[in-house]
């Protein structure tokens, strides 16, 4: 972690709880106001490696709903709509932070958790040709 | 939010702070132990819509380092290595949760923040607008 001098206006924390447990304000600040959320909404259908989105719901997690991408094909889609066996559709994965209720069912106590989610798919060449 | 009956073993929270402020344990639990983090690390180079990864660092945020994808080309890369301008490389974006120190520089007080990150790129057919 990065050592940051405490500001005198900071909430108190006992040493035994710091930095293990912190206070988090759940009033989400959204930095994406200028971004149209629909921008990438149709890429899943128009991609040469199209994907479907599956809803993953867990009330013990925040956010409780996460959308997981599953590539529709193993290969990529050619201009004529048929499969290209020489290319592969693969999921692009990202580790994200979520809050897990801990102890379970507690409304105001969480643990930070890292989960791997598939965000979409991309089309890759299966073989990397190494040039001598 | 989902109303969940409080477990008697839960930490106390005063009504005025709930559900706005919660306690979060920062000892991250990683659910991805079975996943090899190197698996998709070379897709950015082998994709028909390759991307570069840019480091975005902010000590007032947790995690402080986030990697942002920027598509290398406007078009997509063909098998011969040339760019196909009839297709478009586009970023796949995802909203993720981060913790923002609030007040600034406070080590144990955060606000939840949603930010939009580009995770990778995919190759899509452009939308053709037909003029009547």
């Amino acid at each position: 972690g990065i050592a940051i001098p405490r500001n005198s206006g900071c909430p108190n924390s006992e040493d035994k709880n710091f930095p293990r447990t912190v206070m988090v304000n759940l009033n989400i600040h959204n930095r994406n106001t200028s971004t149209n959320p629909k921008r990438s909404s149709d890429y899943y259908n128009r991609s040469t490696s199209p994907w479907n989105l599956h809803r993953n719901e867990d009330p013990e997690r925040y956010p409780s709903v996460i959308w997981e991408a599953k590539c529709r094909h193993l290969g990529c889609v050619k201009a004529d709509g048929n499969v290209d066996y020489h290319m592969n559709s693969v999921p692009i994965q990202q580790e994200i932070l979520v809050l897990r209720r801990e102890p379970r069912h507690c409304p105001n106590s969480f643990r930070l958790e890292k989960i791997l989610v598939s965000v979409g798919c991309t089309c890759v060449t299966p073989i990397v040709h190494h040039v001598a | 939010g989902i109303a969940i009956p409080r477990n008697s073993g839960c930490p106390n929270s005063e009504d005025k702070n709930f559900p706005r402020t919660v306690m979060v344990n920062l000892n991250i639990h990683n659910r991805n132990t079975s996943t090899n983090p190197k698996r998709s690390s070379d897709y950015y180079n082998r994709s028909t819509s390759p991307w570069n990864l840019h480091r975005n660092e902010d000590p007032e945020r947790y995690p402080s380092v986030i990697w942002e994808a920027k598509c290398r080309h406007l078009g997509c890369v063909k098998a011969d290595g040339n760019v196909d301008y009839h297709m478009n490389s586009v970023p796949i974006q995802q909203e993720i949760l981060v913790l923002r120190r609030e007040p600034r520089h406070c080590p144990n007080s955060f606000r939840l923040e949603k930010i939009l990150v580009s995770v990778g790129c995919t190759c899509v057919t452009p939308i053709v607008h037909h003029v009547a």
């Epitope: 094909h73 499969v83 020489h86 | -």
Partner: antibody, heavy 120, light 107 residues
Framework: EVQLVESGGGLVQPGGSLRLSCAAS????????MSWVRQAPGKGLELVAI????????FYPDSVKGRFTVSRDNSKNTLYLQMNSLRAEDTAVYYC?????????????WGQGTLVTVSS | DIQMTQSPSSLSASVGDRVTITCQAS??????LAWYQQKPGKAPKLLIS???SLETGVPSRFSGSGSGKDYTFTISSLQPEDIATYYC?????????FGGGTKVEIK
Amino acid sequence: EVQLVESGGGLVQPGGSLRLSCAASGFTFSTYGMSWVRQAPGKGLELVAIINHNGGSTFYPDSVKGRFTVSRDNSKNTLYLQMNSLRAEDTAVYYCARDPRHDGYFFDYWGQGTLVTVSS
Amino acid sequence: DIQMTQSPSSLSASVGDRVTITCQASEDIYDRLAWYQQKPGKAPKLLISGATSLETGVPSRFSGSGSGKDYTFTISSLQPEDIATYYCQQYWSVPWTFGGGTKVEIK
């Protein structure tokens, strides 16, 4: 019940031709990728051809490229393999196999095979 | 082409034994691996796809694991009806290629 029945095998001289058929039943043939896989006597398995659900994509390994042609007639629920310029090394049991998806990557149902012998 | 090296080529084990077969690809195949069982005079039967996903109706004593280039097929408790030759197949890069097979016999 899914069934794949191959026919058309037999003895043929080197340089000759043969056309194999695979009659499919028990599933909607037009929505599945299909393949031909062969097995030389006492040997392992080798991919011969792949065709996607509508016939719009095909693939052949170098060992048969230019000599073999895979096709399908979805109205007749039948898969074909046209084999020309046959060689002794093409001697094998030829299986038709179904992919559980549209395209032909791995195979959840196989026929019982038809033996092709190339010999003078 | 991607080479699939399967080992051992044959093995003999007792009923109830744990049997392990390995398959090594010449390069990363990103879990795109299937395992088949072929009994003498019969067509192959799909057991596992995606390296670990057991096909419907396949007994749970069969399992698959691995990633990257190295994959393993396990029979947790060998049964008399498991006598067969087992093949792995990669479907990451065309042409799809098979391992040389492992013949499993009962001691």
